[in-house]
């Protein structure tokens, strides 16, 4: 579709002659008529198939033809064809005498053929005018002419349709040529699909509008390459969406069991040492003079038994007093008025006299102890063994029973369960007083993680495409991975062919 | 136990500003995304606000774009909107909860109430 | 935006009946949709997700079921404690919405 148009320049007729040889009276009062067809080696009768116009008079005799763009006596004159420019043309533009009406001539009778030409050649679209002179023997007219396409259309033959726009259809100019120049943010054939955000993930992201980066479920971030963990998962985190890989300290399905009580919650009081034993499980060593499930308790000042040699303790409110037993005295009956004449030393201690009589000291046999060697030793009242061993007194030594997970003289050296790697099937491993424990893998259980789970959502391959399946942290729930070049929950839609999204 | 405690709400003119705040605990604050859901006064549920783990990207509703900011502290385990231009069809129950735009809000705190009214 | 639409609006119920909601999406969710019960002057809370997924402490007789652009949540047998209002949304398109409620209270 487009226009051919003919600019009428000059037409000179000096003696004012018609093609008969007749003068015009009193002067030729000229219009124009055109005839446009398809290419004719011989220009012959008929039917104006690319078109026809006919002007109102322009002049009389010569004149200078002036543009006009409104109204009648449009100039350049207006051909317009439906149809794909062929490329050639014939061409007839006839001068006609009127002695009638000046704008309708054409209907007038009496008119008179002053002058013809006919062209017939080739002519490329475009912008470019190209001029012409016809002359014959008694007139001369100067014109030129082109061919250029409608609006909205475009190409060598005005036959490729294109119509800028910026809606839901598309987002594009037209170029030169009718090929489509997307706008800024959009690609596509039709420039109908956003370009997103740079860098947003292929397969987890997607948009509806340019530079935008919307995550598919499971994903988040600017980029839509941070996975999100599940939703009942409280103390973990994710390589893959919904996965609940527990944070250090933590395990159970939902990371929710807190493997190091001690660490998180400091429960045990007054310098005690707190040992992690299982899932919110703890135990409390407490110092001396302290008792209680977290040592709170603080014993009475007589409970160290500050009396020696047999005085009785009385307790006060800060502080505490002694009462000794005759030939005793001091703060802690340490001093006697007995000597060694008095036989003071017991289990066959031996007496050493000291301050020229005034005093005793006795040096017991193993095993025992005390300012007359009355007390059996006790080697376990210095809380020797560590993480919750058992004290127990073995004659001239004392031995340290450890509670599982624990060795050592002192019960100070922790066994590592979780060295031997005990969990199967990549399942975590936990080192806890009763010994390790596993958290499991989806789709495995059992103390070891050894039992595959076989009900689990995978089992019946929902993940297409290649995907790899990976079971929720519910039996009935999955996550599919998907290879590149697929998305959707189930990897069902190559990222070609996306789901269409609602804009 | 999983916590979410709002504050901030209150009454306010139009054109006016409110900023509120939500507390969270017992969970890894860090590894989860937050949002903010509101629901006008005996009305649905309408998704307001998210933000990313990382702080790196928020989201928001058409209507609240330009004049409400999510954020998070979470050093402190907060979350934050700020709310400017405040009109009255935003008056609601604003909700914190944990989830993103595409994920299911999987916890939810107690409400707190912005009133916008001259 | 996707619109979500659940149906009854609300409906009357006895304890001990098998109650439904559907909920219909105007486009196609993929499964990700989730199930909220609100009761009056209480937040609300997830049931579940993943269209058929039990969130973590929901009782058993809560079940979903549905695909493309058609949810259900059906209550197998009611409890006094399950009257309140229930909300489905979706989460597969930025943004993400929900369903109107619907008001489940006793005959």
């Known amino acids: 579709s487009g226009i051919f148009q003919l600019r009428l320049q000059e037409f000179a007729n000096e003696r004012g002659m018609l093609a008969n040889g007749r003068p015009c009276e009193p002067g030729c009062r000229t219009f124009f008529r055109i005839c446009l067809k398809h290419y004719q080696a011989t220009f012959s009768e008929g039917p104006c198939t690319f078109g026809n116009v006919s002007t109102p008079v322009l002049g009389t005799n010569s004149f200078v033809i002036r543009d006009k763009n409104s109204g009648s006596g449009r100039n350049p004159l207006q051909l317009p064809f439906n149809f794909t420019w062929p490329g050639t043309f014939s061409l007839n533009i006839q001068a006609w005498h009127t002695p009638g009406d000046d704008l309708r001539p054409e209907t007038s009778p009496g008119n008179s053929l002053i002058s013809q030409i006919i062209i017939q050649g080739s002519l490329a679209v475009g912008k470019n005018w190209k001029s012409d002179e016809q002359n014959n023997t008694l007139t001369r007219l100067r014109y030129s002419y082109r061919v250029v396409c409608s609006d909205n259309y475009y190409g060598d033959s005005c036959s490729r349709l294109c119509k800028k726009r910026d809606d839901h259809f598309g987002h594009y100019e037209c170029q030169p040529d009718g090929s489509l120049s997307c706008l800024p943010g959009w690609t596509g054939k039709y420039c109908d699909q956003p370009i997103c955000l740079s860098g947003c993930h292929e397969q987890n992201g997607y948009c509806s509008k340019p530079d935008e980066c919307n995550c598919r479920p499971g994903w988040q971030g600017p980029l839509c390459n941070e996975c999100i963990p599940h939703n009942g998962c409280r103390h973990g985190t994710c390589t893959i969406p919904w996965q609940c890989a527990c944070d250090e300290g933590w395990g159970g399905l939902f990371c929710d069991q807190d493997l190091n009580y001690c660490t998180h919650h400091s429960p045990c009081k007054n310098g005690s040492t707190c040992s992690n034993s299982g899932p919110r499980g703890y135990t409390c060593t407490c110092l001396p003079g302290y008792t209680g499930e977290h040592c709170e308790l603080e014993l009475s000042k007589c409970a160290s038994n500050p009396c020696r040699n047999g005085g009785s303790c009385k307790d006060h409110e800060n502080s505490y007093h002694c009462l000794c037993p005759p030939g005793y005295y001091g703060q802690h009956c340490e001093h006697s008025t007995l000597t060694c004449a008095d036989s003071p030393c017991f289990n066959g201690g031996s007496c050493r006299e000291r301050n020229q009589g005034a005093s005793y000291a006795c040096e017991c046999p193993p095993n025992f102890t005390g300012s007359n060697c009355e007390k059996k030793v006790d080697r376990c009242t210095s809380n020797p063994c560590a993480n919750g061993g058992q004290c127990l007194n073995r004659g001239p030594s004392r031995t340290c029973r450890c509670r599982p997970g624990f060795t050592g003289t002192h019960c100070e050296l922790h066994i590592s369960d979780c060295a031997r790697s005990p969990c199967a099937h990549g399942g975590t491993c936990h080192d806890l007083e009763n010994g390790p424990v596993c958290t499991c893998p989806a789709g495995f259980s059992g103390r070891r993680c050894e039992v595959r789970i076989t009900n689990d959502a995978c089992a019946s391959g929902p993940c297409f495409n290649g995907a790899t399946c990976y079971t929720g942290l519910s039996p009935n729930n999955f996550v599919c991975n998907c290879p590149y070049g697929f998305v959707g929950s189930r990897c069902e839609f190559p990222v070609g062919l996306p789901p269409s999204f609602p804009w | 136990e999983v916590q979410l405690v709002e504050s901030g709400g209150g009454l306010v003119q139009p054109g006016g500003s409110l900023r509120l705040s939500c507390a969270a605990s017992g969970f890894t604050f860090r590894h989860f995304p937050m949002a903010w859901v509101r629901q006008a006064p005996g009305k649905g549920l309408e998704w307001v606000a998210t933000i990313s783990s990382s702080d790196a990207w928020p989201s928001y509703r058409d209507s609240v774009k330009g004049r409400f900011t999510i954020s998070r502290d979470n050093a402190k385990n907060s979350l934050y909107l700020q709310m400017n231009s405040l009109r009255a069809e935003d008056t609601a129950v604003y909700y914190c909860?944990?989830?993103?735009?595409?994920?299911?809000?999987?916890?939810w705190g107690q409400g707190t109430l912005v009133t916008v009214s001259s | 935006d996707i619109q979500m639409t659940q149906s009854p609006s609300s409906l009357s119920a006895s304890v001990g009946d098998r109650v439904t909601i559907t909920c219909r999406a105007s486009?196609?969710?993929?499964?990700?949709l989730a199930w909220y019960q609100q009761k009056p002057g209480k937040s609300p809370k997830l049931l579940i997700f993943d269209t058929s997924v039990l969130a973590d402490g929901v009782p058993s007789r809560f079940s979903g079921s549905g695909s493309g652009t058609d949810s259900t949540l059906t209550i197998s047998s009611l409890q006094p404690e399950d009257f309140a209002t229930y909300y489905c949304?979706?989460?597969?398109?930025?943004?993400?919405?929900f369903g109107q409620g619907t008001k489940l209270e006793i005959k």
């Open positions: 949304q979706q989460y597969t398109y930025y943004p993400p919405t």
């Open positions: 486009q196609e969710i993929y499964r990700n």
């Open positions: 909860a944990r989830g993103y735009y595409n994920s299911p809000f999987a916890y």
